[in-house]
Interface confidence: medium
């Protein structure tokens, strides 16, 4: 399809950053202000993303690439390409429809985003609680009483739980 198009279509020669201007005998005109074309052969340029309100500009729009936004302090990105900004909470809290709420007893959140997660159940691994959990920190599991013999291994904290619903930034 692309080869056929280039044979028939003079616009296929217009590079990224331009559009093929039908009103000027199909010459390649630069994209208008605040617009871009990331592909060649376009008859129009795309509107640049505007980082307004809670969004701030991380990368300015150029004639060949869109602007990139991140969030103002106190907020963090969600979604592909930072499509949303969500309010930060303190460690030991989670964001609900009514705002930031403290983690319930038996749960913790060691980040400014995401949800409160249950403390690790040390007994499931046959271990005992060495350090109690808080709203901000998980419990630290220690060796079981049976392991407290000479040569027993040292304390092993639980593996950090992956936060659900968020890929690493």
């Amino acid at each position: 399809f692309e080869r056929t198009r280039s044979l028939q279509d003079p616009c296929s020669n217009c590079p990224a950053g331009t559009f093929c201007d039908n009103n000027r005998n199909q010459i390649c005109s630069p994209c208008p202000p605040n617009s871009f074309s990331s592909a060649g052969g376009q008859r129009t340029c795309d509107i640049c993303r505007q980082c307004k309100g809670v969004f701030r500009t991380r990368k300015e729009c150029s004639s060949t690439s869109n602007a990139e936004c991140d969030c103002t302090p106190g907020f963090h990105c969600l979604g592909a390409g930072c499509s949303m900004c969500e309010q930060d909470c303190k460690q030991g809290q989670e964001l609900t429809k009514k705002g930031c709420k403290d983690c319930c007893f038996g749960t913790f959140n060691d980040q400014k985003r995401g949800i409160c997660r249950p403390w690790t159940n040390c007994s499931l691994d046959g271990k005992s609680v060495l350090v109690n959990g808080t709203k901000e920190r998980d419990v630290v599991c220690g060796p079981s009483p049976a392991d407290l013999s000479p040569g027993a291994s040292s304390v092993t904290p639980p593996a950090p739980a992956r936060e659900p619903g968020h890929s690493p930034q």
Epitope: D9, C11, C20, S29, P32, P33, R43, T44, D46
Partner: antibody, heavy 118, light 111 residues
Amino acid sequence: QVQLQQSGAELARPGASVKMSCKASGYIFTTYAMHWVKQRPGQGLEWIGYINPTTVYTIYNQKFKDKATLTADKSSSTAYMQLSSLTSEDSAVYYCARLGGHWYFDVWGAGTTVTVSS
Amino acid sequence: DIVLTQSPASLAVSLGQRATISCRASESVDNYGISFMNWFQQKPGQPPKLLIYSASNQGSGVPARFSGSGSGTDFSLNIHPMEEDDTAMYFCQQSKEVPWTFGGGTKLEIK
């Protein structure tokens, strides 16, 4: 001859969704952006948003961000708009319009009438 | 959002006379020397039709009696001489800033 052929009228219940189409012919579909515009009976025009069929890049009027979803199928040269959670406020004629280089709508579809009624 | 205010809301003009429709923007729609202002004509039961783009450029196949002028925040559409076929609604539209917006429309009739 450049044409945008829109799908037929839709009658829908409140809360339902509708998906309308806009089939392009007479030009290379992927090289022009496709915009959508709403017109309520006897009222003005409202810009909903647009899609670039090549990159599938979309921009929405914030007012319609949770109402409209724009998609495009390059293989059939067709743009689509889905409207969700319909209310009587969504009863209107919806136009697709091709965007010319200096950001003007040079070709319009005939419109799809959506009627929301219980 | 940029608000476009058209005046008058309705207008009756004699055949052969001049019709002038104004469109005022709440902020400038100019950028780097380009005015992102367009004018459309709409007849009952039909989609809008492009008349003028970038404030003063005629759309393809548009008769020479339609002309546009203005920059910044103040724009006008002139129709001279008025013909019977010109009875319609006329809308201005800006494409400088998202969301793109339209004026409320002017109804033009024969006097």
